[in-house]
C-alpha cells in the first residue's frame, strides 16, 4: 500500500481542516488508514482523524482543530496499521479556504431595486470576519448566456442591483462565495442558490415598445 498523491490540506481558519490524498489502488480509507495530526508544540495532544473514501483510491479527512492562530503548524502522519506511509506538515494560515456564506436572500419588495443579503460565515471574533470579500453569481434559468458575476469588495454582506438590469418576467437564481485577500485564500464553495421571479415592470413607454417588439417576433 502506497500513497500515489500526497495529502493536500485546506483550513477554514476556524475549526476544520480538510486533507485529501490518493492511494495507489482501491482502499477502504476508514478501516485501513489513520491520519494523526499534532500541533508542533511539546505538550499538545496528538489527534486521530478517520478518513472517508473519496472515489475508489481517494481519501478525505476532516481534521477538527481548535481556533487557528497564524503561527500554528501541524505535523501530519499517515498510518496504515503500524506502517508510516507519509509524514508531512501543514500550516493552516497558509492554506485557507473560507467557509461558504449562508442565508442568501433576495428582497424584491422595493419595485426598482433588488437587494441580495447573505450571512458572513464567521463569528465576529474570527480574524476573517472583517476581511472577506464576495462574488455574487446571478443567472437565468431560461437563458444560459444570461450569466453574470458581481464583485462585492466592501465588508457589508449585501448587494443592490437595479431590477431593470435583469430581464423581466423570468426566473433567476443567485449564489455567493467568499475569499480573503489578507491570507491569499482560495475561493470558498458557492452558497446554496436561491431563486426568484423578476417581475420588474418597466415604465409604460418602454413596456409598450417592448411588448410591440415582442409581438413582431
Amino acid at each position: 500500500m502506497k500513497v500515489l498523491q500526497e495529502p493536500t490540506c485546506v483550513s477554514d481558519y476556524m475549526s476544520i481542516s480538510t486533507c485529501e490524498w490518493k492511494m495507489n489502488g482501491p482502499t477502504n480509507c476508514s478501516t485501513e488508514l489513520r491520519l494523526l495530526y499534532q500541533l508542533v508544540f511539546l505538550l499538545s495532544e496528538a489527534h486521530t482523524c478517520i478518513p472517508e473514501n473519496n472515489g475508489g483510491a481517494g481519501c478525505v479527512c476532516h481534521l477538527l482543530m481548535d481556533d487557528v492562530v497564524s503561527a500554528d503548524n501541524y505535523t501530519l502522519d499517515l498510518w496504515a496499521g503500524q506502517q508510516l506511509l507519509w509524514k508531512g506538515s501543514f500550516k493552516p494560515s497558509e492554506h485557507v479556504k473560507p467557509r461558504a456564506p449562508g442565508n442568501l436572500t433576495v428582497h424584491t419588495n422595493v419595485s426598482d431595486t433588488l437587494l441580495l443579503t447573505w450571512s458572513n460565515p464567521y463569528p465576529p471574533d474570527n480574524y476573517l470576519y472583517n476581511h472577506l470579500t464576495y462574488a455574487v453569481n446571478i443567472w437565468s434559468e431560461n437563458d444560459p448566456a444570461d450569466f453574470r458575476i458581481y464583485n462585492v469588495t466592501y465588508l457589508e454582506p449585501s448587494l443592490r442591483i437595479a431590477a431593470s438590469t435583469l430581464k423581466s418576467g423570468i426566473s433567476y437564481r443567485a449564489r455567493v462565495r467568499a475569499w480573503a485577500q489578507c491570507y491569499n485564500t482560495t475561493w470558498s464553495e458557492w452558497s446554496p442558490s436561491t431563486k426568484w421571479h423578476n417581475s420588474y415592470r418597466e415604465p409604460f413607454e418602454q413596456h409598450h415598445h417592448h411588448h410591440h417588439h415582442h409581438h413582431h417576433h
Epitope: L39, F41, L43, S44, E45, D66, D67, S70, A71
Partner: antibody, heavy 119, light 108 residues
Framework: EVQLVESGGGLVQPGGSLRLSCAAS????????MSWVRQSPDKRLEWVST????????SYPDSVKGRFTISRDNAKNTLYLQMRSLRAEDTAVYYC????????????WGQGTLVTVSS | DIQMTQSPSSLSASVGDRVTITCRTS??????LAWYQQKPGKAPKFLVY???TLAEGVPSRFSGSGSGTDFTLTISSLQPEDFATYYC??????????FGQGTKVEIK
C-alpha cells in the same frame, strides 16, 4: 470531574530534599502534558517544570534546572516533583496543572501544597 | 526569555463597572496568550486562551483581545464574584512559560 490533588509539602531545611506528588482523576491522564507551577509569598506565579504525556520530554527554567526532576507514572495517574538542594527562594505553594487539550495553556490546577524552606 | 508586563498592578472598581486589564510582551507571541483568575486561598482558574477564546463555562462578560505584543482582558460589567487577581501567561515557543505579575481587582 477533573481533579488534581497535591501532597508532600512541608517544612524543610536549606539544602534538603522533598518529593511532591499529584494524584489525577476524572480524565485520561496518560494523554495530557502536565506541569508544576509555584506561587511565592509575593503571589508571583512561576513555571517550575513540564512533562509531556508519555514522560519522554521534560523542561525546566534555569532557576531549578539540575535541582528539580519532574516524572510521572501513568499507571498510577500520578505526577511527581523531586526537589533537591532546596533554597529559601524555593519557598512557595506548588501547584500541579494539566495542559489544555489543544494548547499549552493550563486548564486545570490542583489546590496546591506549601513548601517552606527555612532553618 | 519573553517578559510579560501587566498593568495596572491593582485597581479599585464597583459592581457594574467595566474593567480592562492589559498585558504586554517583550516579543511577538501571536495569539498564544492565556488569562487566569485567582481568588484568595484558591488555585488559578483558566479563563481565556488564544488571547480571545473563552474557556468552557466562563461567563460572556469576560472577553479577551489583542495579538502580537499587546493584549487586553475586559470584564464588561463587574460582578461581586469577579473580585480577584488576574494573570496573563504566554505559551509561545515552549518549553518556557511566563506569567504576568498579576492585577488585583478590589472593591471600591
Amino acid at each position: 470531574e477533573v481533579q488534581l490533588v497535591e501532597s508532600g509539602g512541608g517544612l524543610v531545611q536549606p539544602g534538603g530534599s522533598l518529593r511532591l506528588s499529584c494524584a489525577a482523576s476524572g480524565f485520561t491522564f496518560s494523554t495530557y502534558g502536565m506541569s508544576w507551577v509555584r506561587q511565592s509569598p509575593d503571589k508571583r506565579l512561576e513555571w517550575v517544570s513540564t512533562i509531556n504525556s508519555n514522560g519522554g520530554s521534560t523542561s525546566y527554567p534555569d532557576s531549578v534546572k539540575g535541582r528539580f526532576t519532574i516524572s510521572r507514572d501513568n499507571a498510577k495517574n500520578t505526577l511527581y516533583l523531586q526537589m533537591r538542594s532546596l533554597r529559601a527562594e524555593d519557598t512557595a505553594v506548588y501547584y500541579c496543572a494539566r495542559f489544555f487539550r489543544f494548547r499549552n495553556a493550563m486548564d486545570y490546577w490542583g489546590q496546591g501544597t506549601l513548601v517552606t524552606v527555612s532553618s | 526569555d519573553i517578559q510579560m508586563t501587566q498593568s495596572p498592578s491593582s485597581l479599585s472598581a464597583s459592581v457594574g463597572d467595566r474593567v480592562t486589564i492589559t498585558c504586554r510582551t517583550s516579543e511577538n507571541i501571536y495569539s498564544y496568550l492565556a488569562w487566569y483568575q485567582q481568588k484568595p486561598g484558591k488555585a488559578p482558574k483558566f479563563l481565556v486562551y488564544n488571547a480571545k477564546t473563552l474557556a468552557e463555562g466562563v461567563p460572556s462578560r469576560f472577553s479577551g483581545s489583542g495579538s502580537g505584543t499587546d493584549f487586553t482582558l475586559t470584564i464588561s460589567s463587574l460582578q461581586p464574584e469577579d473580585f480577584a487577581t488576574y494573570y496573563c501567561q504566554h505559551y509561545y515557543g515552549p518549553p518556557t512559560w511566563t506569567f504576568g505579575q498579576g492585577t488585583k481587582v478590589e472593591i471600591k
